[in-house]
Interface confidence: low
């Protein structure tokens, strides 16, 4: 296991006294109920805590809630329930916090049965003051802020009306009826689906997709026979019912729905689903469910147009529509994703890609770990990561994998070491190089969080017993110190730190229970005195990301460029600070054939990097050929991988072919063969 508090670990001096002076307890005079916590703004120190308690009476349930506010990262809280007139707040809508640092907050209140509409409380000063507003409708969903303008809100009503406010919820206008789903796009555009006949459920597959670019003054129908739609990066996706049967296909638009292209993906039947796993402005990862109740499907990665897809990973675990998948974007290193596959023997195995889905491999076995009972060969096995699926299966996994963009290379996750995921109690593993190598960090399940951009990692053991000890590491999980933060153990419910991992404060939430009472309590610990000084130049070292072969001058080239980072030395105990910016130096690589994907109608034979023309088009390739737009059917066989920045090197220039000539089928009439999807 990873070294603990032993000789080789340089202990932080006098840390008990330093932490004791910076540990702040707050007892909430609430019966237990439930608690929800939201950060308002970035680096503001403002936290809102909503406690709710349901008292079951004979006829109905009486709800009571309290609102607390902190402006010092949770060290002190003030009861501000009177600012919302002691109203009961509906927790299913949560606290709707405005984008960026707008300081806006919307709370949705519970109102009595016969009222004309709902009620909200609005704040635009980081919850210092609230304004009560009665709504002309009963909200079905949480208020949604426009990403571009936090004064613009939209909501769906229980009557399926689409309501918009242009003045941060002061006045509301119903802009459309019979709406199933609505989403903000870019430039304050709203996309929504409507039904014509009975209801959203009854009309599924016969919905219309509408767009308004002026908050409801004018509308354009941009799609018909719609099953559902989604937004990802600069792509707008719609699943559209086929003419002849109950199957549906994905169509893609990159111009807000003005024009559509059929995606070269398999069609799916009634019981199947599509899911956008991840998307950015360059490309999308799309999961396509297998027929039947298999619990798996295939991951496809798109080209830069979202039209041509390459098969990325087979047997990808994804249980049911809206079910569980372990797909995780490792945000601490570009191009890295982790997920699970369901193998032929029904065991679950973890796979990782370092090149945005181009190639998947097993995770390397941690050096300091033995292979468990799932391993056939005790010397050869892999690390398998527990994520959403394990949590849903009630395995002893308190947290999903964790990574932060500003804690470069660090990934923390529960896992087991063997041939597949084990149901045994997992341990916690850490990678400091974005998933290439792993080390056992902590024995047994823990809650964990990253502070000060990776300068501190904090963990608490997952236990059914009350706890009073927190562990922390200043060297990326190699060595750990323990600190007793209270004499009286608490039933632990969660760790909270400000999103973005820049803070040095951690809040430990839990409750105390005695014979008659139960109370919420939080302990906020500030680590600023542990990291006594600001980091200097000498505290950082140069690290080449994706380095696997230092002798190779193309070492680190991923998606056409390599990046060198300045990273904090493990031995340095200092503050990165709230203003820390990741320092990276990119350099362009020469192009190889691996920087190109095969365009429509081409494929890569095994162990070859050249794209070869498909001898005949079958299945969904043929459908794409028949219905795809003509300009997408002329190609030289290669297309640069989305986001790939390589220059020079190989430029796979070859004759441009018109694949329309290959589009033939006995099942479709000639006039259909020239039709463009529109």
């Amino acid at each position: 296991s990873a070294p603990g508090e032993d000789e080789e670990c340089g202990r932080v001096r006098d840390f008990v006294a330093k932490l004791a002076n910076n540990t702040h307890q707050h007892v909430f005079d609430d019966a237990r109920g439930s608690v929800s916590l939201s950060w308002v703004g970035d680096s503001t120190g403002v936290i809102l805590v909503l406690t709710t308690f349901h008292v079951p009476l004979v006829i109905m349930t009486f709800g009571q809630s309290k609102l607390y506010r902190s402006e010092d990262y949770g060290k002190n809280f003030k009861d501000i329930t009177d600012l919302i007139n002691n109203t009961f707040i509906r927790t299913e809508f949560g606290m709707a916090i405005g984008p960026e640092n707008s300081g806006k907050v919307v709370l949705t209140a519970e109102v009595s049965g016969g009222s004309r509409g709902g009620r909200i409380f609005r704040s635009s000063d980081f919850a210092k003051n609230f304004v009560q507003t009665d709504l002309p409708f009963h909200p079905l969903t949480q208020m949604m802020y426009s990403p571009q303008n936090s004064d613009y809100l939209l909501a769906l009503s229980t009557e399926n009306g689409l309501w918009v406010s242009k003045n941060f919820g002061g006045k509301w206008e119903e802009i459309h009826k019979a709406v199933c789903l609505a989403k903000w796009g870019s430039d304050n555009t709203i996309f929504f689906t409507t039904y014509a006949n009975g209801s959203c459920k009854a009309d599924l597959g016969a919905l219309e997709l509408w767009r308004t670019s002026d908050l409801g003054k004018s509308f354009k129908t941009i799609g018909v026979k719609i099953y559902s739609f989604g937004l990802g990066g600069r792509f707008l996706f719609a699943s559209v019912m086929a003419d002849k049967d109950t199957t549906r296909r994905i169509h893609v638009s990159t111009d807000q729905g003005d024009t559509w292209s059929m995606a070269q993906l398999p069609s799916v039947g009634q019981e199947q689903f599509y899911s956008i796993l991840a998307a950015n402005d360059d490309m999308v990862f799309m999961h396509v469910d297998e027929p039947g109740d298999t619990g798996f499907g295939t991951i496809f990665t798109s080209d830069d147009r979202g039209i041509v897809y390459s098969k990325s990973l087979d047997r990808h675990l994804y249980t049911t529509t809206g079910g569980e998948t372990d797909f995780t974007n490792v945000t601490s290193l570009r191009g890295v994703y982790i997920t699970s596959v369901l193998s032929e023997d029904n065991s679950i195995q973890t796979m990782i890609t370092f090149d945005q889905g181009g190639r998947w491999t097993h995770l390397r076995k941690p050096e300091n770990s033995e292979c468990d009972a799932t391993a056939k060969n005790k010397n050869e096995c892999s690390l398998h990561i527990h994520a959403s699926y394990s949590i849903s299966q009630k395995l002893n996994v308190p947290m999903a994998p964790l990574s932060e963009p500003n804690a470069v290379g660090i990934v923390i996750a529960h896992g087991s070491v063997g041939d597949a995921i084990s149901v045994m109690v997992p341990d916690v593993y850490i990678s400091d190089d974005g998933g290439y190598s792993w080390t056992k960090m902590l024995e047994g399940p823990h809650y964990y969080t990253i502070l000060d951009s990776g300068g501190i990692i904090v963990a608490i053991e997952h236990s059914s017993r009350p706890i009073n000890v927190i562990k922390f590491s200043t060297d990326e999980g190699q060595c750990w110190q323990t600190y007793t933060f209270t004499r009286d153990p608490i039933y632990f419910t969660g760790l909270a730190s400000e999103p973005g991992a820049r803070s040095m404060n951690i809040s430990i939430w839990g409750f105390t229970e005695s014979f008659l009472t139960s109370q919420w309590v939080s302990y906020t610990i500030d680590f600023k005195d542990i990291l006594e000084r600001n980091c200097e130049e000498k505290d950082y070292t140069i690290w080449l990301a994706h380095s696997t072969d230092p002798e190779d001058y193309e070492d680190g080239c991923i998606l056409g460029y390599k990046e060198q980072f300045l990273r904090l030395r493990k031995s340095s105990v200092c503050q990165n600070g709230r203003d820390y910016v990741v320092t990276k130096q990119p350099s362009i690589c020469l192009c190889s054939l691996e920087d190109f994907l095969c365009d429509f109608g081409y494929y890569r034979p095994e162990n070859d990097s050249k794209c070869v023309e498909q001898p005949e088009l079958k299945g969904h390739d043929l459908e794409f050929c028949l219905y795809g737009r003509e300009e997408h059917l002329t190609t030289n066989g290669y297309r640069k991988i989305p986001g790939d920045k390589c220059q020079g090197g190989v430029n796979p220039v070859r004759e441009v072919k018109d694949l329309k000539k290959k589009c033939t089928s006995n099942f479709l009439s000639p006039e259909k063969q020239n039709s463009k999807s529109n």
Epitope: Y553, E554, I588, L590, N607, D608, S609, G648, G649
Partner: antibody, heavy 129, light 107 residues
Framework: QVQLVQSGAEVKKPGASVKVSCKAS????????MSWVRQAPGQGLEWMGI????????SYAQKFQGRVTMTRDTSTSTVYMELSSLRSEDTAVYYC??????????????????????WGQGTTVTVSS | EIVMTQSPATLSVSPGERATLSCRAS??????LAWYQQKPGQAPRLLIY???TRATGIPARFSGSGSGTEFTLTISSLQSEDFAVYYC?????????FGGGTKVEIK
């Protein structure tokens, strides 16, 4: 046609520096790395280092680290190799060679090496007091 | 660094005969190996790349084989213009390294 033309012969005193140029023509200059190889009289070939014309990044053999500097000028499609602190054992013919290293792949896991396919005519550097 | 060892140092062969040259790497270089021919007063010329692929314009009598650590260059029927020094070179790990060379001379 593709060719590499090197600068003329040089005679230098010990401790001095020499800068050899290599002008590329007949292909896109930024599409290939350039290696430098030297050959002492009656000896074998010795690789000195490589430069990526796109960004100018370099990789030098340990033996020459600190003494050799490779640069490029994309506007003239020319690479340069400068060797400092010359000693008599640096007397050799210095070649530039187009090196497509690693620019194509032979399948999932391995790079494919295309070899140094075009060589300059060589520049003789004599170090003598 | 990877050490490349060529044998024999000198090979005496009659015109029309077959010549077999060996090259051994101190560790695996996969198939990242090239063969060059050099005649007196000339720059080296690429013969074989990727351990076994003939470069453009190279006659079919030259062939390369092997992978990992053991490689062979075969000249099936020596012509008068083939008498020269032959070098192998690895490009698996930096620094690129050459073998010491095999001189093919007329017997």
């Amino acid at each position: 046609q593709v060719q590499l033309v090197q600068s003329g012969a040089e005679v230098k005193k010990p401790g001095a520096s020499v800068k050899v140029s290599c002008k590329a023509s007949g292909y896109t200059f930024t599409s290939r790395y350039m290696s430098w190889v030297r050959q002492a009289p009656g000896q074998g070939l010795e690789w000195m280092g490589i430069i990526n014309p796109v960004g100018g990044s370099t990789s030098y053999a340990q033996k020459f680290q600190g003494r050799v500097t490779m640069t490029r000028d994309t506007s003239t499609s020319t690479v340069y190799m400068e060797l400092s602190s010359l000693r008599s054992e640096d007397t050799a013919v210095y070649y530039c060679a187009r090196d497509p290293s690693g620019i194509a792949a032979a399948g999932p896991a391995s790079r494919y090496y295309y070899g140094m396919d075009v060589w300059g005519q060589g520049t003789t550097v004599t170090v003598s007091s | 660094e990877i050490v490349m060892t060529q044998s024999p140092a000198t090979l005496s062969v009659s015109p029309g005969e077959r010549a077999t040259l060996s090259c051994r790497a101190s560790q695996s270089v996969s198939s990242n190996l090239a063969w060059y021919q050099q005649k007196p007063g000339q720059a080296p010329r690429l013969l074989i790349y990727g351990a076994s692929t003939r470069a453009t314009g190279i006659p079919a009598r030259f062939s390369g084989s092997g992978s990992g650590t053991e490689f062979t260059l075969t000249i099936s029927s020596l012509q008068s213009e083939d008498f020269a020094v032959y070098y192998c070179q690895q490009a698996r790990l930096g620094p690129w390294t050459f073998g010491g060379g095999t001189k093919v001379e007329i017997k």
